[in-house]
Amino acid sequence: EPPTACREKQYLINSQCCSLCQPGQKLVSDCTEFTETECLPCSESEFLDTWNRETRCHQHKYCDPNLGLQVQQKGTSETDTICTCEEGLHCTSESCESCVPHRSCLPGFGVKQIATGVSDTICEPCPVGFFSNVSSAFEKCRPWTSCETKDLVVQQAGTNKTDVVCGPQDRQR
């Protein structure tokens, strides 16, 4: 009686169960009653990452430097190439098909998380007691100067964009 279902890592063809090709190999010919499935390795620029019956391997992803991409991890016969972005850029999507410049945090905002090749800068508003007076992709909110520790007094209150201005204490004669 011919099988209607096959074991894991097998496939049903011509009423018989044939072994799937292992990752890194493609199907060349189905098994016969005399021989196992004929599988052959993917070429240098190709891969297959699962047990399969594909007659063609997939082409490795190309990390196009014109799009700001560079190779993070070279592909093998079993894995695709992983791209990342050049310094100062990050991926526009999870599949990292193109790159855009990191955004800067505007005055009043500081860097919560510095950008990587795969994620953009994360900014946060400077809370009370902190400020940022620059547009930057690296600088965190800085604390207001403590006038007291310098034996000075606050002459001008700080904001989220400006530091406090300290001045000498009024001396009573």
């Epitope: 063809i13 060349v28 010919s29 189905d30 016969t32 021989t35 052959l40 390795p41 620029s45 007659t55």
Partner: antibody, heavy 117, light 111 residues
Framework: EVQLEESGGGLVQPGGSLRLSCAAS????????MCWVRQAPGKGLEWVAC?????????YYASWAKGRFTISKDTSKTTLYLQMNSLRAEDTAVYFC?????????WGQGTLVTVSS | DIVMTQSPSSLSASVGDRVTITCQAS??????LSWYQQKPGQAPKLLIY???TLASGVPSRFSGSGSGTDFTLTISSLQPEDFATYYC?????????????FGQGTKVVIK
């Protein structure tokens, strides 16, 4: 029944052309690489050409066959072809079709091509 | 193209003899080496593939070994039905090039 059957052989004059056919039955033609192998009378086996499995038309030829011989297939007819042009006396042989690429698990019985004036 | 050199071209042997046929590839073919048996008026029959894997139904007296460029077919105890011609076949592949080559054949005749 799983089988291959060649046809189209015969007598042809030097410089002439011939198209061989190989009808496949009993297996999925589309997922199998197919090849042609020939054998001159009283001589050994000689690889001619192969065509890859799948829908893409990827072909491979022995260096001596390039330019004169063309392998092709019609998946809907489960038939393999070998178009032979500019035939010479030394092309006289039994032509076998075979299933596989790195090994040949299934062979037809062959068709004889005679090139003579 | 890949060139396969097979030896001897013929050998005389008796039933029960141990027979060895060798095959050398012009470049490394890893384990992509097959052996075929052919009898007069018939198509070749696959005996061994991937150097040492016996095709189903082939008697265990047939065995294959080797790797890279040097390969051997051994018949441990020759039987009457084994008198035939044997061919090795090598497969070579690079990224854009595929080649198959057959040895010249070894005719095994009765001593």
């Amino acid at each position: 029944e799983v089988q291959l059957e060649e046809s189209g052989g015969g007598l042809v004059q030097p410089g002439g052309s011939l198209r061989l056919s190989c009808a496949a039955s009993g297996f999925d033609f589309s997922t199998n690489a197919m090849c042609w192998v020939r054998q001159a009378p009283g001589k050994g086996l000689e690889w001619v050409a192969c065509i890859a499995a799948g829908s893409s038309i990827i072909t491979y030829y022995a260096s001596w066959a390039k330019g004169r011989f063309t392998i092709s297939k019609d998946t809907s007819k489960t038939t393999l072809y070998l178009q032979m042009n500019s035939l010479r006396a030394e092309d006289t042989a039994v032509y076998f079709c075979a299933r596989g690429l790195s090994r040949f698990a299934l062979w037809g019985q062959g068709t004889l091509v005679t090139v003579s004036s | 193209d890949i060139v396969m050199t097979q030896s001897p071209s013929s050998l005389s042997a008796s039933v029960g003899d141990r027979v060895t046929i060798t095959c050398q590839a012009s470049q490394s073919i890893s384990s992509y080496l097959s052996w075929y048996q052919q009898k007069p008026g018939q198509a070749p029959k696959l005996l061994i593939y991937l150097t040492s894997t016996l095709a189903s139904g082939v008697p265990s007296r047939f065995s294959g070994s080797g790797s890279g460029t040097d390969f051997t077919l051994t018949i441990s105890s020759l039987q009457p039905e084994d008198f035939a011609t044997y061919y090795c076949q090598g497969y070579y592949s690079s990224s854009s090039y595929v080649s198959n080559g057959f040895g010249q054949g070894t005719k095994v005749v009765i001593k």
